[in-house]
Amino acid sequence: QSSERRVVAHMPGDIIIGALFSVHHQPTVDKVHERKCGAVREQYGIQRVEAMLHTLERINSDPTLLPNITLGCEIRDSCWHSAVALEQSIEFIRDSLISSEEEEGLVRCVDGSSSSFRSKKPIVGVIGPGSSSVAIQVQNLLQLFNIPQIAYSATSMDLSDKTLFKYFMRVVPSDAQQARAMVDIVKRYNWTYVSAVHTEGNYGESGMEAFKDMSAKEGICIAHSYKIYSNAGEQSFDKLLKKLTSHLPKARVVACFCEGMTVRGLLMAMRRLGLAGEFLLLGSDGWADRYDVTDGYQREAVGGITIKLQSPDVKWFDDYYLKLRPETNHRNPWFQEFWQHRFQCRLEGFPQENSKYNKTCDSSLTLKTHHVQDSKMGFVINAIYSMAYGLHNMQMSLCPGYAGLCDAMKPIDGRKLLESLMKTNFTGVSGDMILFDENGDSPGRYEIMNFKEMGKDYFDYINVGSWDNGELKMDDDEVWSKKSNIIRSVCSEPCEKGQIKVIRKGEVSCCWTCTPCKENEYVFDEYTCKACQLGSWPTDDLTGCDLIPVQYLRWGDPEPDYKDDDDK
């Protein structure tokens, strides 16, 4: 997958929807300049391609949705990388430009005669891409041409700004909400001193910024904050881990506003350096409940608490997907490459990966083996349905009483489509209401997951709570087998009675040394001792002063007993 030749998946239709999926991993650092993508991806790639193809089939066969109009698609690979996605988006735009020029009779042959050549239909909207950083770059381009974009996993808060990203919408909430959920978890377990890590790029940066802002308001201190690229080398991850250990044993909790592959990089470094079990990772939805993050590094991931967008598995997708075979699935141009990668074998007569695998693929192989549905599948499907319902509502208002595309919809006006999309609401694939607020965002519902050792060498994610529009619910007994197991992540222990906190110069407010007040002083507040006035003395609990009762000597009282300084 280098920059010279990009594969595209096509499905014909009256209206064409574009899609950007990360069919391959992002280019490694040394391959970035040539935009050479990494290995093929199943959950984030192939499954999403198939979801698009099959969802469109379902929409096209639904007589109540866009009757007499067939939806088609053009799917391109973003490789989870801005440069690749931009290159692919330019292809979408080029198609649209050529088409609109044709509509206006601007396409002519060199000799001056008009062209009989029909180019591809224009893209009316784009689904995806997955990454926030990549989505921002794509949106910067698409909005110039009034092409609406619906994202299924780009959650950056920046994308809520409609002055900057007018044609952007999403079926997922903004990260401001999960940052709040993460802070609520930190608060729940009285973790007041945590380390912070985020993935370089928009998703991690804006998410961590929100986490830090909210933490500060709640009196939570950040020991240190670090950033790293998902495709950074081993050395970079090792260095980061060593830096994190310098805050041990105080900052045992590491809040990671990270993409899944960043978390995997951290887990691998923990293995290399012998740091399994030293940290508790609190991960954002980039990690969620993904097995491709923890596979092979389960011991390092144990105990991790993660945020996952609420999205149950879609049964009908599995029914379709698990029957797919390389000899019959020709509409997905990446499927054979994926099959070989998935089963580490060679398909007869398939040239691309021949050198890599020695054994030939067995005909009994099936996708049912170790199948895990993409955790964001519901959102991908909801994004596609949103586009369909938006087009449906647009058709109803522009072509009343007409089945199919009327002239008022030729060509489709992106501004009108955006208007229609923003008003769309329907029941999503999981039975929840899909709607968009004035920023094009959807409401926030999260599940809280915990990665646990369930038995000898068997690990899994367990649902231990939920966060729904500001309310956190946690099953503490499921996370911690007993109260004493709750990990501590604090800089300083509370001071004893009669002591005040002294914060060292340059330290955060969570780190102090405890100093006792002087004999004649009481604790005025947690940072100050105050001397009792003459004639008074600190109370037993040292919270104030009591007047010293005046005792008058009378004739006949025994003489006072004077002691010299050197009397012991």
Epitope: Q235, D238, L248, P249, L273, G274, G277
Partner: antibody
Framework: QSVEESGGRLVTPGTPLTLTCTVS????????MGWVRQAPGKGLEWIGI?????NAWYANWVKGRFTISKTSTTVDLKITSPTTEDTATYFC?????????????WGQGTLVTVSS | AYDMTQTPSSVSAAVGGTVTIKCQAS??????LSWYQQKPGQPPKLLIY???TLASGVSSRFSGSGSGTEFTLTISDLECADAATYYC????????????FGGGTEVVVK
Amino acid sequence: QSVEESGGRLVTPGTPLTLTCTVSGIDLSSNAMGWVRQAPGKGLEWIGIIYASGNAWYANWVKGRFTISKTSTTVDLKITSPTTEDTATYFCARDATATWDYFNLWGQGTLVTVSS
Amino acid sequence: AYDMTQTPSSVSAAVGGTVTIKCQASQSISNWLSWYQQKPGQPPKLLIYRASTLASGVSSRFSGSGSGTEFTLTISDLECADAATYYCQQGYSVANVDNAFGGGTEVVVK
């Protein structure tokens, strides 16, 4: 702050032996503690370390021959089945961090002699 | 494995001279390397940590350099008291380690 090893003596092969490292002025919940040995006339050989968290790590060659554990003021090194090759001076040392970096405080060592 | 190779095993130099000891890691350990001095009948003493930081109370005649896999300890203006065995130690990883210490270098002062 100090570190002192004890328990070194003459033992016959196969007789389990526990060496104890007693610390003073050191918070074992904040610092990792390591064990290093030195056979007569030979170099330093790292045995293992116990992190502040209580997790222990060992050199590849250890393979169950040694176990490190700790209480709030002591760190134990159990030699499960000593052989004559285990004859050495055993040092206990404090790591400067909670995990693994460098040893900035060493005990004087305790001599273990394994002989039949 | 993270293994340390020290060279030479023995070196001799005159008082006032300079000695250089090299330590090579089997794979990159960034700057997580320390140097120790050990005299007969005594425990090792920390000289340098993180490749180049002098431990407190150690003479500035000792200096360390290097990063990645190649490291150097330099003793300048040699004194009789510097006669000892010197060891390097990687502080990078405890996973897959045969010996965290180098084999040692004996310094003889003439």
